[in-house]
Amino acid sequence: MAERAALEELVKLQGERVRGLKQQKASAELIEEEVAKLLKLKAQLGPDESKQKFVLKTPKGTRDYSPRQMAVREKVFDVIIRCFKRHGAEVIDTPVFELKETLMGKYGEDSKLIYDLKDQGGELLSLRYDLTVPFARYLAMNKLTNIKRYHIAKVYRRDNPAMTRGRYREFYQCDFDIAGNFDPMIPDAECLKIMCEILSSLQIGDFLVKVNDRRILDGMFAICGVSDSKFRTICSSVDKLDKVSWEEVKNEMVGEKGLAPEVADRIGDYVQQHGGVSLVEQLLQDPKLSQNKQALEGLGDLKLLFEYLTLFGIDDKISFDLSLARGLDYYTGVIYEAVLLQTPAQAGEEPLGVGSVAAGGRYDGLVGMFDPKGRKVPCVGLSIGVERIFSIVEQRLEALEEKIRTTETQVLVASAQKKLLEERLKLVSELWDAGIKAELLYKKNPKLLNQLQYCEEAGIPLVAIIGEQELKDGVIKLRSVTSREEVDVRREDLVEEIKRRTGQPLCIC
């Protein structure tokens, strides 16, 4: 075993030597000799016995997407992207890995979930944890003070995910953010509007968007007697209230985080409250909370936000929830999280949340962390938790036993007799050139029944059948797969007829 490990190390070292010689542009003979040595070392390694025991699987917390799952995913993305574009967003992309330094100190307690890469020639790198910090880095690096952008990409977290609930270590985020100095709460309200539009369009069930403000939380902690140094850690405890009872949260704050029980009780009086604009009004009258500058600012902004949400017609979807304390260090103002609601067992019960499907908030200080002069660019944004949405949509389709098409083929070019491969190839090429999504079976003389069966399985709506008689007459038999009716279409009219039947625009503009 030790011998094998030594050989493996030698193979690695020799490989590095060969690469080094190539970079140094060493003599061809020397490179050739060192490559020959490398091959001899590899030959000595022989087959790895452990390879026989190797279980083929994807790494923990990851999955492949089958064509069926990809079809679902593309539909979901399509809804999201159309909404983002409707709201005037541009699109950007950033590297999948960032300098470790870029990500450090931005995520608080979640920093332990960042994937670090092994040293790649001097640069300490980490896989991105979200799309927000790279966005802030992008703004600072390019000295941008104003942009509305969306970004859809994979992010990585060393979580212990419950994949059945749509949680992964590699997953997509769909982010929309507005950066720039604007009048209070207008961009924030638009972000919430976008969130509601997307969740409604996806038809994944009833949802509720919880809203809070970091300043209200911080003010509340201050008046309850939490020391500054404990704010962030107590935040992460409070944020668990949607999953566990107040008693459990209190035990964690007192037992694990060293908070005095009376301080925890004072916090409990606040964080168990949720409601609408009336709760904002009520807290503005709170003798202690209204005396705290930060909390007062936050409450004032929330009051304004609710006005705009009413104008946008989504105030019925929003709940002011004092327990919402999203666990990311960079939020500075309004924070929000959308949860899907399960239908309660009995009428009169409160709807139950089944996990976050979208979230976001205001982060006015993040860009400043990257700017040498600390210049701030106010930002607000949202992130759609598409992995959870994919899971929900997939489950719904399975329950409905709905057939999902995994291709967009409009027509199969088929033949009824033998020796018509050339004609099929010519016709399919004509269709492709005209922008028609077409296929043919890769056989010289396929049976007509097999060709029709293929259409049934793949959900292809039309078959263009070539026969010797049709060739003589200059027509193509166009068959509807579902109704089985056939009509002869003049070859020159075929493209137009297919487009008409499949609802495709007549020109590829």
């Epitope: 030698l10 070292l13 030597r17 020959a36 040595k37």
Partner: antibody
């Protein structure tokens, strides 16, 4: 077990020639790079020359280049060092050595050495 | 050519002592380093290869470490049979060169 036995050493006058041989056994000789390493009396070790398994590649220390020739006969499991134009500074014990893992320039197995003395 | 410098050139120690010998390369050699032990009138014997791999049959009290330019050979607890001369050798590029040797003597 691996055995390397050198022969051919002796006393020779400056400018003279000698041919050292190394008989190998206990391993597949034709798989291995081989080398000659020498050690002057009371001094350190010096890598003189090496030859690849198929004789395609050879190399020499600057101090012997043009005067010494390394060769091998895989059929006879033998390694050779032809030494011409010998100098007093070539006086040393000459070791035949087998590479580590066939191609790694670290002498895993050594012969007992053969003494070459160049003196008038 | 790559120069290999060993230190110290000689060291006196007692049975049971921990001894460290260092070897410095004039330029980076990655892990391409070996350590040999030689006793008078005998051929050298390979102890450690590629900086830290123990040759089979060599007692575990011998260990090697380092990469780049600085390397060490450590004998954790000297035994009577360990008194000898030790050489390091770089196998990074030809001409392969040895250190001048470190003589380990009984105190």
């Amino acid at each position: 077990q691996v055995q390397l036995v050198e022969s051919g050493g002796g006393l020779v006058k400056p400018g003279g020639s000698l041919r050292l041989s190394c008989a190998a056994s206990g391993f597949t000789f034709s798989d291995y790079y081989m080398s000659w390493i020498r050690q002057a009396p009371g001094k350190g070790l010096e890598w003189v020359s090496y030859i690849s398994d198929s004789s395609r590649y050879t190399n020499y220390a600057d101090s012997v280049r043009g005067r010494f020739t390394i060769s091998r006969d895989n059929a006879k499991n033998s390694l050779y060092l032809q030494m011409n134009s010998l100098r007093a500074e070539d006086t040393a014990v000459y070791y035949c050595a087998r590479y580590l893992y066939q191609v790694i320039a670290i002498a895993k197995s050594w012969g007992q050495g053969t003494l070459v003395t160049v003196s008038s | 050519d790559i120069q290999m410098t060993q230190s110290p050139s000689s060291v006196s120690a007692s049975v049971g002592d921990r001894v460290t010998i260092t070897c410095r390369a004039s330029q980076g050699i990655s892990s391409w380093l070996a350590w040999f032990q030689q006793k008078p009138g005998k051929a050298p014997k390979l102890l450690i290869y590629v900086a830290s791999n123990l040759e089979s049959g060599v007692p575990s009290r011998f260990s090697g470490s380092g990469s780049g330019t600085d390397f060490t050979l450590t004998i954790s607890s000297l035994q009577p049979e360990d008194f000898a001369t030790y050489y390091c050798q770089q196998a990074n590029s030809f001409p392969y060169t040895f250190g001048q040797g470190t003589k380990l003597e009984i105190k």
